[in-house]
């Protein structure tokens, strides 16, 4: 299925990476949660791969094509 | 605590061109979206553009495309919106706000008025 | 381009009623819609995001639902600082905002 590179993106409502302490932003839910399809405004937000969207956080998050990583799914894996 | 300081507002006649900032403070500036939401007097909201986190990825209103170009400096903390060809529709007080799709925290805007 | 239609554009109301705007998008967006209050002056406040959700430090009596097209923001029991101006946006297809009911002390 790829590879899952959560989204820099975090729509104000949660911090952009998990070890950062964000308590005065966070929302009442958990980190954790289901997907669904990503705004139509992502439609080319993941270069190579796939677009979700994460919604307890809100933000759109790539599952990348094999071989590419990055948030955008923007490099080539060189260890691929 | 979260802060955004919109700066370089002002008058300017139509055609003209005017850069916005926005310096942010109390978080992570670099790990955020950010927006540029605008509020003709005595109307509603519009948004005007928003930059992911890395400046990569940016999208525009309609009615400002090809005209406002929205930048950031992350080692600075700021925010841009470079306006030209301004016209009188142009004028707002111009937000900038934290996040992409939804605006968490918003400064306290930046007048521009476009007059001849 | 997706449009926003609340109604009612403006309405009166006492402290203590329970008061309803609805927002109307042009085509279906699911969930995505946000609920901001602004009050003359100063900038927006996120109240409610994915249609229904409650924004952090929010008070309770602010509710939001709807999917698809029709989406209601609704204020339980109204407080004297509850008398702003309530705008709806969508965020599916590029960010719109409502036109934004304004509501007054009666």
């Known amino acids: 299925d790829g590879n899952s590179t959560r989204s820099p993106e975090t729509n104000g409502l949660l911090c952009g990476d998990p070890d950062e302490n964000c308590a005065a932003t966070t929302t009442q839910s958990k980190r954790k949660g289901h997907f669904s399809r990503c705004p139509k405004q992502y439609k080319h937000y993941c270069i190579k791969g796939r677009c979700r969207f994460v919604v307890t956080e809100q933000t759109p998050s790539c599952v990348c094509d094999e071989g590419y990583i990055g948030a955008r799914c923007e490099r080539v894996d060189l260890f691929y | 605590q979260v802060q955004l300081l919109e700066s370089g507002g002002g008058l300017v006649q139509p055609g003209g061109s005017l850069r916005l900032s926005c310096a942010a403070s109390g978080f992570t500036f670099s790990r955020y979206w950010i927006s540029w939401v605008r509020q003709a007097p005595g109307k509603g909201l519009e948004w005007v553009s928003y930059?992911?986190?890395?400046?990569?990825?940016?999208n525009y209103a309609d009615s400002v495309k090809g005209r406002f170009t929205i930048s950031r400096d992350n080692s600075k903390n700021t925010l841009y919106l470079q306006m030209n060809s301004l016209r009188a529709e142009d004028t707002a007080v111009y937000y900038c706000?934290?996040?992409?799709?939804?605006?968490?925290?918003w400064g306290q805007g930046t007048l521009v008025t476009v007059s001849s | 381009d997706i449009q926003m239609t609340q109604s009612p554009s403006s309405l009166s109301a006492s402290v203590g009623d329970r008061v309803t705007i609805t927002c109307r998008a042009s085509q279906g967006i699911i969930s995505y819609l946000g609920w901001y209050q602004q009050k003359p002056g100063k900038a927006p406040k996120l109240l409610i995001y994915?249609?229904?959700s409650l924004q952090s430090g929010v008070p309770s009596r602010f509710s939001g639902s709807g999917s698809g097209t029709d989406f209601t923001l609704t204020i339980s029991s109204l407080q004297p600082e509850d008398f702003a101006t309530y705008y709806c946006q969508q965020y599916d297809a590029l960010n719109t905002f409502g036109q934004g009911t304004k509501v007054e002390i009666k």
């Open positions: 706000a934290r996040g992409g799709s939804l605006f968490d925290y």
């Open positions: 994915a249609a229904s």
């Open positions: 930059i992911d986190s890395t400046g990569t990825f940016i």
